[in-house]
């Protein structure tokens, strides 16, 4: 019986060339979180392990920064960064919880004159 829920920043938008914070929060469970994975589609972006700390995938090292907290900061955004991002909480004894965030990266002028999603 998994009682936990993941709250995310939901659908967000950001300007091309800018940065964005991806954030998830696991609540309503006392389970022990052992690791949080951040993934984009099938690509692993980063891992935050309770004992070993952060590991950023080599191909994203220049554009991904750990934190704040268990979140992830994406920098130097390009239109190709548009898509789904997943935070995957590995817990004991519950198992795995997954949260989804959709990021849309907009051309600067579009973002200024009517972004579809608000950054919290």
């Amino acid at each position: 019986m998994m009682t936990g829920t993941i709250e995310t920043t939901g659908n967000i938008s950001a300007e091309k060339g800018g940065s964005i914070i991806l954030q998830c929060h696991l609540s309503s469970t006392t389970a022990q979180v052992t690791q949080v994975n951040w993934e984009q589609q099938d690509q692993l972006l980063a891992i935050c392990n309770a004992d070993l700390g952060w590991h950023i995938s080599p191909s994203f090292k220049d554009r991904v920064a750990p934190g704040p907290g268990l979140g992830l900061t994406l920098q130097s955004l390009t239109v190709n960064d548009t898509g789904e991002y997943f935070c995957i909480y590995h817990t004991y004894p519950d198992g795995t919880y997954t949260g989804r965030i959709f990021l849309e990266v907009l051309e600067s002028s579009v973002a200024e004159h009517g972004a579809r999603f608000q950054i919290p």
Epitope: M1, T30, Q32, G69, P93
Partner: antibody
Framework: EVQLVESGGGLVQPGGSLRLSCAAS????????MNWVRQAPGKGLEWVAE??????????HYVESVKGRFTISRDDSKNSVYLQMNSLKTEDTAVYYC???????????WGRGTLVTVSS | EIVLTQSPATLSLSPGERATLSCSAS???????LYWYQQKPGLAPRLWIY???DLASGIPDRFSGSGSGTDYTLTISRLEPEDFAVYYC?????????FGQGTKLEIK
């Protein structure tokens, strides 16, 4: 061998304060949740407070009867956890045990306890 | 708050007999969050069974645990003299964590 040693117990008047300490050895302290559990003379066990890891932003939780009066904290550099007890009541009289927990490793170790007596 | 009620409060048995200790929760507890501890006079409690049915390190296999939802059981198939003690069930499924009031297993 893992060892937990509590200290700081003693006789205190109602309304007074005490600070309990628990020192750990033989283990990487920062990897473990820490708890305080108490046992009134001749009675059963009562969980008092918990502090999690830096990974969890040192999240703390308390039993309702001590909220606002007791504060749990930890110093990973000193391998120690503390319980600051203010506005003590006669019903706080108990042996206070420090416990070290790592759920996914099935690790659960207790100290020998320190006696707190609240009496006028 | 999840209230854990243990029964019986005292169980008087002889070595060699079978012991069954019960723990009833006021609301459902996931099996991974239900533990049992043993405590002997003057000593700290010791983890005995975790996740409902898994024996802690060094615990003899005459002990077993079972249950789900709101009803859990600790069973000792054949009592040895060193088994006589107080046993507490414990849940860490929700805050505040709680313990049962204990079952004292005494020699008849």
């Amino acid at each position: 061998e893992v060892q937990l040693v509590e200290s700081g117990g003693g006789l205190v008047q109602p309304g007074g304060s005490l600070r309990l300490s628990c020192a750990a050895s033989g283990v990487t302290f920062s990897n473990y949740w820490m708890n305080w559990v108490r046992q009134a003379p001749g009675k059963g066990l009562e969980w008092v407070a918990e502090i999690r890891l830096k990974f969890n932003d040192y999240a703390t939780h308390y039993v309702e009867s001590v909220k606002g009066r007791f504060t749990i904290s930890r110093d990973d550099s000193k391998n120690s956890v503390y319980l600051q007890m203010n506005s003590l009541k006669t019903e706080d009289t108990a042996v206070y045990y420090c416990t070290m927990v790592r759920r996914n490793w099935y690790f659960d170790v207790w100290g020998r306890g320190t006696l707190v007596t609240v009496s006028s | 708050e999840i209230v854990l009620t243990q029964s019986p409060a005292t169980l008087s048995l002889s070595p060699g007999e079978r012991a069954t200790l019960s723990c009833s929760a006021s609301s459902s507890v996931s099996s991974g969050y239900l533990y049992w501890y043993q405590q002997k006079p003057g000593l700290a409690p010791r983890l005995w069974i975790y996740s409902t049915s898994d024996l802690a390190s060094g615990i003899p296999d005459r002990f077993s645990g079972s249950g789900s939802g709101t009803d859990y059981t600790l069973t000792i198939s054949r009592l040895e003299p060193e088994d006589f003690a107080v046993y507490y069930c414990h849940q860490w499924s929700s805050y505040p964590y709680t313990f049962g009031q204990g079952t004292k297993l005494e020699i008849k």
